[in-house]
Each structure stands twice: as C-alpha cells, then as structure tokens.
Interface confidence: low
C-alpha cells in the first residue's frame, strides 16, 4: 500500500498582527485510522495547538469539517494572531491505539507575524549646548516583526550621516526594538531647526512613521553685549544703554552695577522673537553726572539661562561732561568678556 504522506504545502506563512493565519495540511490516505494533531515546535517540548478530539482551543478552528466522512483536509485557522504566535507549526498524524502512536509529521510551516513598529519617540540631550557643539538625539521604536527595518535621521530635510543604530535582540524573537542615536552639530541658526527620525517597515503600507524633536530644546545661543552712551541731556543726566542681542532661550537676568554696587536688576520677559528664533533686549540706565565727583564705572552684567555672568563695563567721564549735549560714545570694555566665545 502507498505510504501515508502528511502534506504541509507552505514552508512559511506571514500574517499581520490581529489577522487570522491559515495553516494548510492534507493527508494522502485515510488509513491507518487515527487522529491529526497540530503542534508548535518539535521535540519533547513542543506545544499542542489543536486536537480535534479533546481540549479547548478557542482561537483555533478547522478549515473544513473534520467530522465529515473521508475528510483528508486538516487545515486550521488561528484567529487574532499576535507576535507570540510566531513559530513553526507541525501537522502530525497518529495511529489509533492505547495510547495513540505518532506516525508521520508534516514538514512544518513557519508562521511569521508582521507587527507594526510603535511610533518613534525622539529624545534630546538633558542639558542645552551652544553652537559648534555636538549633541545627541535618540530615537526608539518597539514591537515590530519581522526584524528588517530601516531608520533614517533628518535635520531640516537633510539626511544625517553621523548615526548609530541597533536592532534588538540579535537572535530570533517574536518582536524587535530599534534604538538609534544621531549626533548633530549645532549652529546659531538652529533655534527653529527640527530633527526627524523616520522608521520604515514592511507593515507600514504607506509613508514611514516619524518622530520629531525641536533643536530649540537642545540649544543655547549666548548673547552678544554692547554698552553705549547716548547724548548728555540738559538735566546733566547721561543715558547708557546695554544691548543684549541674539540670545536663546529667553531666560535672562540683567543687572546694572554703579562702581561695583547693584543699581537695578531686571528679568527678560515677553520679548519679541527675531526671525531666527533668538531674542534681543535693550536696557537703559540714567546716570546723574552732577551727583558724582569722580568718573562712574557702569557694568552691565548678564546671566543667561543659568550660565556664569558676562560683564560689559563702561566709564562715564564726569570731567568730560560740561552741560552741553555730547555725542554718542561707544563703550570701552573693561569687563571680563567683550563677547561670549562660541
């Protein structure tokens, strides 16, 4: 008599998570008499997936009526597939007995589950950095299968190349995670810049998933300081201005010192934004020249975003101020920093 064949026609089946998977199995002969059982995996640790005679398998249904006379189709359908269902499924014929004896196994069908990656989450550096420094952004996405995936980084539409990407685990798994780090060199113009992490995968039947981060969260643009003296007023008062320009973020405190003593402290708030996202601020100090016998040393001291203070000093020459109106005079810099170094 012809030897019984257990035929599993598909070597592999790929199914999207949430869908149903059909695992086909037919036998070439009705004899010998005995049941068919489905297992996941081979060997002693295999897992029983479906047994027509006994057991409760709520997600597994036979494709054709197994009680039908002369039935030779023992295909099954597994509903609501999850990544945990991945594996190789074997259709196994048993000879009826006490107990039943395994007679022949099909070649197996590998079920792979296509699961979508989670939306990429991009995180930036914990502390701000200044222009010309390199900061790192990380992007993570989880729960996808199969393992093949690509991740690209962009800054303002341009692909970044200083990138390191890892997909875990390295071996076989029901689902995978990707983590990528991109290194970005900051420029003073990056307040409005954005980095984008783009993930593409077989399950994404359309545009890739994207996660974004704004460089405004990562950058500090230190201010430029300039102190100038306006014209001498008729009432013997000199108007000195401190111009603080091109800084970001807005968090800034300005202190005027007269001969080393605090004269006034101001906090920046509700400033208009420059086109490039930075801010400017101008503070004025009126100095009554007639109240001083000696020259007055004025210092504009700026603390920006919790950084060490930057000073710009200016001397008002009392002897040089008769009552007539003077002209604008640029500051002489006697401070520690003429400008911040970037």
């Amino acid at each position: 008599e012809e030897e019984l064949q257990v035929i599993q026609p598909e070597k592999s089946v790929s199914v999207a998570a949430g869908d149903s998977a059909t695992l086909n199995c037919t036998v070439s002969s009705l004899i010998p008499v005995g049941p068919i059982q489905w297992f996941r995996g081979a060997g002693p640790g295999r897992e029983l997936i479906y047994n027509l005679k006994e057991g409760h398998f709520p997600r597994v249904t036979p494709v054709s009526d197994p009680t039908k006379r002369n039935n030779m189709d023992f295909s099954i359908r597994i509903s609501n597939i999850t990544p945990a269902d991945a594996g190789t499924y074997y259709c196994v014929k048993f000879r009826k007995g006490s107990p039943d004896v395994e007679l022949k196994s099909g070649a197996g069908t590998e079920l792979s589950v296509r699961a979508k990656p989670s939306a990429p989450v991009v995180s930036g550096p914990a502390v701000r950095a200044t222009a010309e420094h390199t900061v790192s952004f990380t992007c993570e996405s989880h729960g996808f299968s199969p393992r093949d995936i690509t991740l690209k980084w962009f800054k303002n539409g341009n692909e970044l190349s200083d990138v390191q990407t890892n997909v875990d685990p390295a071996g076989k798994s029901v689902s995978y995670s990707i983590r990528s780090t991109a290194r970005v060199v900051l420029t003073r113009r990056d307040v409005h810049s954005q980095v984008i992490c783009e993930v593409a995968h077989v399950t994404l039947q359309g545009d890739p998933l994207r996660g974004t981060a704004n460089l405004s969260e990562a950058i500090r643009v230190p201010p430029f300081l300039e102190v100038t003296q306006q014209s001498m007023r008729a009432d013997n008062q000199v108007n000195v201005t401190c111009q603080v320009t091109k800084f970001y973020p807005q968090r800034l405190q300005l202190t005027w010192l007269e001969n080393g003593n605090v004269s006034r402290t101001e906090m920046a708030s509700a400033l208009p934004e420059n086109k490039d996202g930075t801010y400017n601020w101008t503070s004025w100090l009126l100095v009554n020249v007639s109240a001083h016998r000696d020259d007055v040393k004025l210092t504009c001291q700026v603390e920006h975003d919790g950084q060490p203070a930057v000073n710009k000093s200016f001397s008002v020459k009392v002897s040089a101020h008769p009552k007539e109106q003077g002209s604008n005079t640029a500051a002489e810099n006697t401070g520690t920093n003429e400008r911040n170094i970037y």
Epitope: G157, A200, G206, D207
Partner: antibody, heavy 123, light 107 residues
Framework: QIQLVQSGSELKKPGASVKVSCKAS????????MNWVRQAPGQGLEWMGF????????TYAQGFKGRFVFSLDTSVSTAYLQISSLKAEDTAVYYC????????????????WGQGTLVTVSS | DIQMTQSPSRLGASVGDRVTITCRAS??????LAWYQQKPGKAPKSLIY???YRYIGVPSRFSGSGSGTDFTLTISSLQPEDFATYFC????????TFDQGTKLEIK
C-alpha cells in the same frame, strides 16, 4: 549603485501585444514597490498603478484595468508591464519607478526611475 | 480623483533668479506630496518627497514647503541646468496624480 534599466523601444501594430521589462539592480527588488507611469507625447505623467513586490499583488489605476498586466520575476530582479490589444492611443513612453520607502509596498513618492521605454502603435 | 494644479504653466527666468512654483491639490493631501524635474527626452528626476524633504544628492537650492492643499517648490538661485519641466504629485489617495507641469524657460 541603484539602477532601473528598461527594455528598448517597441514599434507595434494595433491589436498586438507588448511586454516592457524593468530590471532592478543595486538593491533587493522585493523590498520596494514598483510603479508604472505613462507619458504620452508632449503630455504629463500618468500613474498606471504598482506591483507589491513582496506579495506579487498588482494594483491598477482606473484607466488601466483589463489590457494592462504587471508581473514580476524575482529570480532575475525584473518587473514587467504587458499591454495587450494595443491601440494608437497607447503610444507613449512607459516608465517604471521605485516607491521611496524601504519595505514600503504601497504606491507613494518615487525615488528612482527607469530610463523609459517608447512604445509606438502604428499601422 | 484628486486634481493637481500647478502655476504658472510656463515661467521665464534668468540664471541667479529665485524661482517659486506653486502646486494646489483639489483636496487635503497632508504632506504626501512629491516634486520631480524632467528634461526633454529624459526620465523624471526625484527632487522632494513629503513636501519638504530633499532626496540625497539634490542641491540645497531646491526647497519645498506647504501642507494640506497648497505647496511650493523654490529654487533659490537658478543654475543653467535647472531649466526643465517640474511636476508635483500627490500620494495621499489613490489614484496617485500628477499635475501637468511647469516649464521653466530661459528668459
């Protein structure tokens, strides 16, 4: 580097059939959908549809159902466009174009194009 | 089908000019918009996808903007090799549709 190389120009009589090939190199053809785009003389671009190179399943735009067939032979990394019962109005340049995203099997933006195949239908 | 309308259909310009081509979709396509350049007798060349992203190798003088229904392709300083026809394409909804193109000519 990545290239899509199409077969040469064809001159056919009305009622005949033509098969245009598009050979992909520099990447795995099964990772990117392949689109077909028609450009009639002096006209704009018209999307005909695409083939999902992972499953082999074609999707046809409305005006291209019936006489147009997209197929694939992954063993030679080649996509095909077959047009049967040719008409004079089928005279055009036919382009294959790769969908941009890796594992992006839908039609979408196209990153690489074949050089085009001119099909002329004339009695 | 989503109709794509580009303006102008022909545009005269000189080397060094800043050129703007606009493209309008008959309904919202999000950012699923691409731009292509085509020279006579040649295949189209891909410039921009997802409205703003340049393909690698595309000069930075090309930039895209817009979302929803109104999109712009800008060439900041026109070079001799930029004289060509430019097409926009939406890929938000089937069928994918192109506009009729803007022919950029030497003034």
């Amino acid at each position: 580097q990545i290239q899509l190389v199409q077969s040469g120009s064809e001159l056919k009589k009305p009622g005949a059939s033509v098969k245009v090939s598009c050979k992909a190199s520099g990447y795995s053809i099964t990772n990117y959908a392949m689109n077909w785009v028609r450009q009639a003389p002096g006209q704009g671009l018209e999307w005909m549809g695409f083939i999902n190179t992972y499953t082999g399943e074609p999707t046809y735009a409305q005006g291209f159902k019936g006489r147009f067939v997209f197929s694939l032979d992954t063993s030679v990394s080649t996509a095909y466009l077959q047009i049967s019962s040719l008409k004079a109005e089928d005279t055009a340049v036919y382009y294959c174009a790769r969908t941009r995203g890796y594992y992006d099997f839908d039609g979408g933006a196209f990153d690489y194009w074949g050089q085009g195949t001119l099909v002329t239908v004339s009695s | 089908d989503i109709q794509m309308t580009q303006s102008p259909s022909r545009l005269g310009a000189s080397v060094g000019d800043r050129v703007t081509i606009t493209c309008r979709a008959s309904q919202n396509v999000g950012t699923h918009l691409a731009w292509y350049q085509q020279k006579p007798g040649k295949a189209p060349k891909s410039l921009i996808y997802s409205a703003i992203y340049r393909y690698i190798g595309v000069p930075s003088r090309f930039s895209g903007s817009g979302s929803g229904t109104d999109f712009t392709l800008t060439i900041s300083s026109l070079q001799p090799e930029d004289f060509a026809t430019y097409f926009c394409q939406q890929y938000n909804t089937y069928p994918l549709t192109f506009d009729q193109g803007t022919k950029l000519e030497i003034k």
